[in-house]
């Protein structure tokens, strides 16, 4: 399901159940991912020993993942909501030719890994509401994803492996950070 | 960092109550306020977070709908309007500060409110 | 909603004991967790937030560990102003609730 199901069955009895504000259901999107994610990494580190991996060697990759910086003004030092906003949404139109690429990655999890691209489609669409300044957002050019997920898709087994895992540890960090800065705002 | 909250005392149930907190010693617009209460003898209890810009808030379950969270970022001060007091909301009320991580890095000394006929 | 289990609910221990506080979320809350301390008539006050980073100023035989929905803070070698009360909090989904408390106390 691209959008986390609804309260639990002792929230749906209680009576006046407000609904979720904008901000409520944006939070509560970006966790349903992250537990996704979580779920994702689980499988992956069951079948490789990527996880073990240290960060440093795992660097060593020239994947080009959305990352945050300073500049992006989603750190407490130089926050800026309108910047941090259009940072969240670039980066997270830059992650979907990622999350194409894990779809054929997972056997158990196929389901989930389908849920966490389309999630991922609404977050953008939830985040592009609230965004003033959506001409600052750029959107990947088509052709440019295209090649990378044939570039992605020919690797030998064990880069797949690594990129697999890279992709989910990098897209989980960059939701955690999104996380945290929306809830400054 | 200098937390001072203000405004709790005896309301009737039913009965309103603002309480506020004010800041000093950092700079109040870039940081997440929460509120957070303990009833006699009880547990801390989590009752409403503002972000520093205001379009994040959040409120307890118990609370949503009789409580508002507010800010005053040029007076550097932190509200909480309680309304439809309940003998349960009985308690000393703090404000806290929100580290980026959410975690309440620092706190004030409280207010007790008290909801008794 | 999350609900956070704290267990023990009270112990007693011994200056230069090591005592550790668990708490158990009920689902998976990906280490968006905080460990406060309360002494009787105070504020609370931060010790560990994102499970295991410890505050400023806390000292560090104060540690924090764990992920998912198991959760610990440890005190090494306690001292007489260790003893109080210990609340673990999420950051998860709201409700932000806290755990019950354990409250230490001198033997």
């Known amino acids: 399901a691209p959008v986390p199901p609804g309260e639990d069955s002792k929230d749906v009895a209680a009576p006046h159940r407000q609904p979720l504000t904008s901000s409520e259901r944006i939070d509560k999107q970006i966790r349903y991912i992250l537990d996704g994610i979580s779920a994702l990494r689980k499988e992956t580190c069951n079948k490789s020993n990527m996880c073990e991996s240290s960060k440093e060697a795992l660097a060593e990759n020239n994947l080009n993942l959305p990352k945050m910086a300073e500049k992006d003004g989603c750190f407490q030092s130089g926050f800026n909501e309108e910047t941090c906003l259009v940072k969240i949404i670039t980066g997270l139109l830059e992650f979907e030719v990622y999350l194409e690429y894990l779809q054929n990655r997972f056997e158990s999890s196929e389901e989930q890994a389908r849920a966490v691209q389309m999630s991922t489609k609404v977050l953008i669409q939830f985040l592009q509401k609230k965004a003033k300044n959506l001409d600052a957002i750029t959107t990947p050019d088509p052709t440019t994803n295209a090649s990378l997920l044939t570039k992605l898709q020919a690797q030998n087994q064990w880069l797949q492996d690594m990129t697999t895992h890279l992709i989910l540890r990098s897209f989980k960090e960059f939701l955690q950070s999104s996380l945290r800065a929306l809830r400054q705002m | 960092v200098k937390l001072q909250e203000s405004g709790g005392g005896l309301v009737q149930p039913g009965g309103s109550r603002k309480l506020s907190c004010a800041a000093s010693?950092?700079?109040?617009?870039?940081?997440?306020m929460h509120w957070v209460r303990q009833a006699p003898e009880k547990g801390l209890e989590w009752v409403a977070y503002i972000g520093r810009g205001s379009s994040t808030i959040y409120y307890a379950d118990t609370v949503k709908g009789r409580f508002t969270i507010s800010r005053d970022n040029p007076k550097n001060t932190l509200f909480l309007q309680m309304t439809s007091l309940r003998s349960e909301d009985t308690a000393m009320y703090y404000c806290?500060?929100?580290?980026?991580?959410?975690?309440?890095?620092?706190w004030g000394q409280g207010t007790s409110v008290t909801v008794s006929s | 909603d999350i609900q956070l289990t704290q267990s023990p609910a009270s112990l007693s221990a011994s200056v230069g004991e090591t005592v550790t506080i668990t708490c158990r979320a009920s689902?998976?809350?990906?280490?968006?967790l905080a460990w406060y301390q309360q002494k009787q008539g105070k504020s609370p006050q931060l010790l560990v937030y994102n499970a295991e980073t410890l505050a400023d100023g806390v000292p560090s035989r104060f540690s924090g560990s764990g992920s998912g929905t198991q959760y610990s803070l440890k005190i090494n070698s306690l001292q007489p102003e260790d003893f109080g009360s210990y609340y673990c909090q999420h950051f998860w989904s709201t409700p932000w609730t806290f755990g019950g408390g354990t409250k230490l106390e001198i033997k």
């Open positions: 689902g998976n809350i990906h280490n968006f």
């Open positions: 010693g950092f700079t109040f617009s870039r940081f997440g």
């Open positions: 806290a500060r929100s580290n980026w991580d959410g975690a309440m890095d620092y």
